[in-house]
């Protein structure tokens, strides 16, 4: 059942990176508008993106309240200009989204190498601790704050003159690696949540190489 001349939304898809979370759907509306509702499994429905002609709705503010909860959304279709109209069952047409658990499913954003410093044959590489939109005590939490030791970083590093990539790992945001004296190295990092089965890894950070401005070299 449903409203005359409206079609139900379909292909409801969660797009989420570092907890910035948007629900997308189809089709582009023709003479209809949409309203989105979201709830946890045990909670009440909350309406968002009222009577919109968009086919996406930013639900970040709702999911960051508890990123470990599982959320369900639904998209209601209404005839444009007659949003009070309901179908024969007395309720507008709607479609449910897949369930979404932000902590387990949000994509890990591309990390950034903040700095690297060489001291003799050791290099300290620091990964930027990216800020998320998750709040605690009115403060935005970093990715490390949210994931704790569940989040690790893999460092790929290689001599500028060579192709083989060595790896190092950390459950902080810092690496301390051994390098050969007099050699220039390049670095790239990847965020990983090993306990996950899907969306385990981020894309790689941009490559940073020694001899560029981000680094600092000290001969000891």
């Amino acid at each position: 059942s449903g409203t005359t001349n409206t079609v139900a939304a379909y292909n409801l898809t969660w797009k989420s990176t570092n907890f910035k979370t948007i629900l997308e759907w189809e089709p582009k509306p023709v003479n209809q508008v949409y309203t989105v509702q979201i709830s946890t499994k045990s909670g009440d429905w909350k309406s968002k993106c009222f009577y919109t002609t968009d086919t996406e709705c930013d639900l970040t503010d709702e999911i960051v309240k508890d990123v470990k909860q599982t959320y369900l959304a639904r998209v209601f279709s209404y005839p444009a200009g007659n949003v009070e109209s309901t179908g024969s069952a007395g309720e507008p047409l709607y479609e449910n989204s897949p369930e979404f658990t932000p902590y387990l499913e949000t994509n890990l954003g591309q990390p950034t190498i903040q700095s690297f410093e060489q001291v003799g044959t050791k290099v300290n590489v620091t990964v930027e601790d990216e800020r998320t939109l998750v709040r605690r005590n009115n403060t935005f939490l970093s990715l490390r704050d949210v994931f704790g030791k569940d989040l690790i970083y893999t460092l790929y590093y290689w001599k500028s003159s060579s192709s083989g990539k060595k790896t190092a790992k950390t459950n902080t945001n810092e690496f301390l690696i051994d390098v050969d004296k007099g050699e220039n190295y390049c670095f790239s990092v990847q965020a990983v949540i090993p306990s996950r089965t899907v969306n385990r890894k981020s894309t790689d950070s941009p490559v940073e190489c020694m001899g560029q401005e981000k680094g600092e070299f000290r001969e000891i």
Epitope: I152, T154, Y156, S163, G164, K165, K166, T167, A168, K169, T170, N171, D178, S188, Q190, V192, P194, R196, T197, V198, N199, R200, K201, T203, D204
Partner: antibody, heavy 120, light 106 residues
Framework: EVQLVESGGGLVQPGGSLRLSCAAS????????IHWVRQAPGKGLEWVGY????????YYADSVKGRFTISADTSKNTAYLQMNSLRAEDTAVYYC?????????????WGQGTLVTVSS | DIQMTQSPSSLSASVGDRVTITCRAS??????VAWYQQKPGAPKLLIYS??FLYSGVPSRFSGSRSGTDFTLTISSLQPEDFATYYC?????????FGQGTKVEIK
Amino acid sequence: EVQLVESGGGLVQPGGSLRLSCAASGFTISGYIIHWVRQAPGKGLEWVGYIDPSNGYTYYADSVKGRFTISADTSKNTAYLQMNSLRAEDTAVYYCARDDQSLSSPFDYWGQGTLVTVSS
Amino acid sequence: DIQMTQSPSSLSASVGDRVTITCRASQDVNTAVAWYQQKPGAPKLLIYSASFLYSGVPSRFSGSRSGTDFTLTISSLQPEDFATYYCQQHYTTPPTFGQGTKVEIK
């Protein structure tokens, strides 16, 4: 169920080439690192090399560097070991193994192995 | 490359015995050490991060670390435990294995 299945082994003459495949099921290889490990008859385990299928990064043991190439096809969920300029000492059972990319990176799943014999 | 020196290379023991195998890393590897069991066929993971029991592995297997020394202990050897055991470090690339310890029936 997580599974790794190697294929492509066989008898090859010294100087010859062979390509081994490692077909994965039950997980997506782009989320992990895939290693190749070999074991000569009656000997211990020797690491050969790895690939991160998400970016194509590789690293090889000195004993195979320049002769062996690891690649991956994420659409087929399969990793490959291309072996060129084969020598008698490359005779071994070749295993692929999954690295969960945690801090200690244990190889949590292994294939059954495929035997490569280099002999004239 | 980091060397993993495993000892003994073989040992004979009886069912019910307590068995200890050690591995010494040539430099610091933190806790990035795993232990594998191999019967004919592919190795199987027993212990990871030096002391964590892998899922489905009997609790008679345990691992410990003291500095660069790592130990695999089988508290009470069972008939199915007769096999070859390998340690492995993956603290740095390349990962390296110990030479193996063959546990045989006395």
